[in-house]
């Protein structure tokens, strides 16, 4: 939602967290700003303090409950407001009617581990974190592998169009250090976006056996 010269973007992690970023042209003086969440059909409301992340943008996380609790559903609408202190009052700087399951961004996958590694192949698994049971199997993944001498941006993306929490990387070079990352996205939601990339998993392929043709 855009009000005046500000932009206010929020995502729901599908369980108990709404993360928001508010950017404002022309930095405010030292003032305190918050995000307030008011669901249309629930007894609770929640607030978080916006903290600067750059010259003109602030971020905060609305913690709605225990990490794995299902605090919102597809029918919920949450009024989100950015409020900034002016004098003793609060001023509404931005406002949006937020549909959580239209604005999803899951947590980065966790627990990456090498299941099996060979000279040219590596099987890696991971887990999804704090993802709603509502998705059932309606998730997709993207993965990338960092090869020596390259950057993450240069790494080709591997797409897994189903809920598959493992991958078998092929055509790797023996005795070589690699890094691997994965991210997840629900198929649901008009404004849904990819999760952050997972923490990189470092692994090394096995050296080619001496005297053998590889």
């Amino acid at each position: 939602a855009v009000n005046g010269t500000s932009q206010f973007t929020c995502f729901y992690n599908s369980r108990a967290n709404i993360s928001c970023v508010w950017s404002q042209d022309g930095a405010l003086q030292d003032t305190s700003c918050q995000v307030h969440a008011w669901p249309d059909r629930r007894r609770w409301n929640q607030t978080c303090e916006l903290l600067p992340v750059s010259q003109a943008s602030w971020a905060c996380n609305l913690i709605l409950g225990a990490p794995d609790s299902q605090k919102l559903t597809t029918v919920d609408i949450v009024t989100l407001r950015v409020l900034c202190r002016e004098g003793v009052r609060w001023r509404v700087m931005a406002i949006q009617d937020f549909k959580p399951f239209e604005n999803l961004r899951l947590m980065a996958p966790i627990s990456l581990q090498v299941v099996h590694v060979e000279t040219h192949r590596c099987n890696i698994s991971w887990e999804i974190s704090q993802a709603s049971h509502y998705f059932e199997r309606h998730l997709e993944f993207e993965a990338r592998t960092l090869s020596p001498g390259h950057t993450w941006e240069e790494a080709p993306l591997l797409t897994l169009k189903q809920k598959q929490e493992w991958i078998c990387l092929e055509t790797l070079t023996p005795d070589t250090q690699y890094e691997f990352q994965v991210r997840v996205k629900p198929l649901q939601g008009e404004f849904t976006t990819w999760s952050p990339w997972s923490q990189p998993l470092a692994f090394r392929t096995k050296p080619a056996a001496l005297g053998k043709d590889t």
Epitope: G4, V88, R89, M93
Partner: antibody, heavy 121, light 112 residues
Framework: EVQLVQSGAEVKKPGASVKVSCKAS????????ISWVRQATGQGLEWMGE????????YYNEMFKGRVTMTRDTSISTAYMELSSLRSEDTAVYYC??????????????WGQGTTVTVSS | DVVMTQSPLSLPVTLGQPASISCRSS???????????LEWYQQRPGQSPRLLIY???NRFSGVPDRFSGSGSGTDFTLKISRVEAEDVGVYYC?????????FGGGTKVEIK
């Protein structure tokens, strides 16, 4: 019905202090801000500052800083405005007015009847 | 501080005729949230001020529809479509966009 009832007229000598009260009724006192506005005889309106009774937080117009103190007593739903080091130019009608804690629409919606303060030697 | 300048100082009007009051701010009073917090207050003789219009053109509850507000940026107008006897008094514009909030000097509406 929202009502703000202010204390009676005061006559003060230069250099003295005056404390004006504003008793609120008809709404939850701690949910709204109380602003103070003054009107010198035959003059316009001047916003002095305000207090949020919910936490006692105050904001004063720079013009009055150091001389004005706003307080509240939530047990009797009353706000106070004290002005010190009075001078003749402080002769005015002092109003309290209610305002929303979140400034969505307007600054002040209901006003007290005003308290006349005369500063004279 | 934002200076609010009203004109005219005095406005003699005939009952049933329209009246128009101008208010000019010394700087743009569009708040950084995109709203313009320009308000109009009426003060009848011997009474406290009363809110008429907020955010330039919105009538406060109970305010007759003969009162209307308009304008943007730095120039604002309060119009009374047909003046009635009870409209006599002083009208103040007020800006709530930039602290300290400030009032105009007032316009006195009287019957000819």
């Amino acid at each position: 019905e929202v009502q703000l009832v202010q204390s009676g007229a005061e006559v003060k000598k230069p250099g003295a202090s005056v404390k004006v009260s504003c008793k609120a009724s008809g709404y939850t006192f701690t949910d709204y801000v109380i602003s103070w506005v003054r009107q010198a005889t035959g003059q316009g309106l001047e916003w002095m500052g305000e207090i949020y009774p919910g936490d006692g937080n105050t904001y004063y117009n720079e013009m009055f800083k150091g001389r004005v103190t706003m307080t509240r007593d939530t047990s009797i739903s009353t706000a106070y405005m004290e002005l010190s080091s009075l001078r003749s130019e402080d002769t005015a009608v002092y109003y309290c007015a209610r305002g929303s804690y979140t400034y969505d629409n307007y600054a002040m919606d209901f006003w007290g009847q005003g308290t006349t303060v005369t500063v004279s030697s | 501080d934002v200076v609010m300048t009203q004109s005219p100082l005095s406005l003699p009007v005939t009952l049933g005729q329209p009246a128009s009051i101008s208010c000019r701010s010394s700087q743009n009073i569009v708040h950084s949230n995109g709203n313009t917090y320009l308000e109009w207050y009426q003060q009848r003789p011997g009474q406290s001020p009363r809110l008429l219009i907020y955010k330039v053109s919105n009538r406060f509850s109970g305010v007759p529809d003969r009162f209307s507000g308009s304008g943007s940026g730095t120039d604002f107008t309060l119009k009374i479509s047909r003046v009635e006897a009870e409209d006599v008094g002083v009208y103040y514009c007020f800006q709530g966009s930039h602290i300290p909030w400030t009032f105009g000097g007032g316009t006195k509406v009287e019957i000819k």
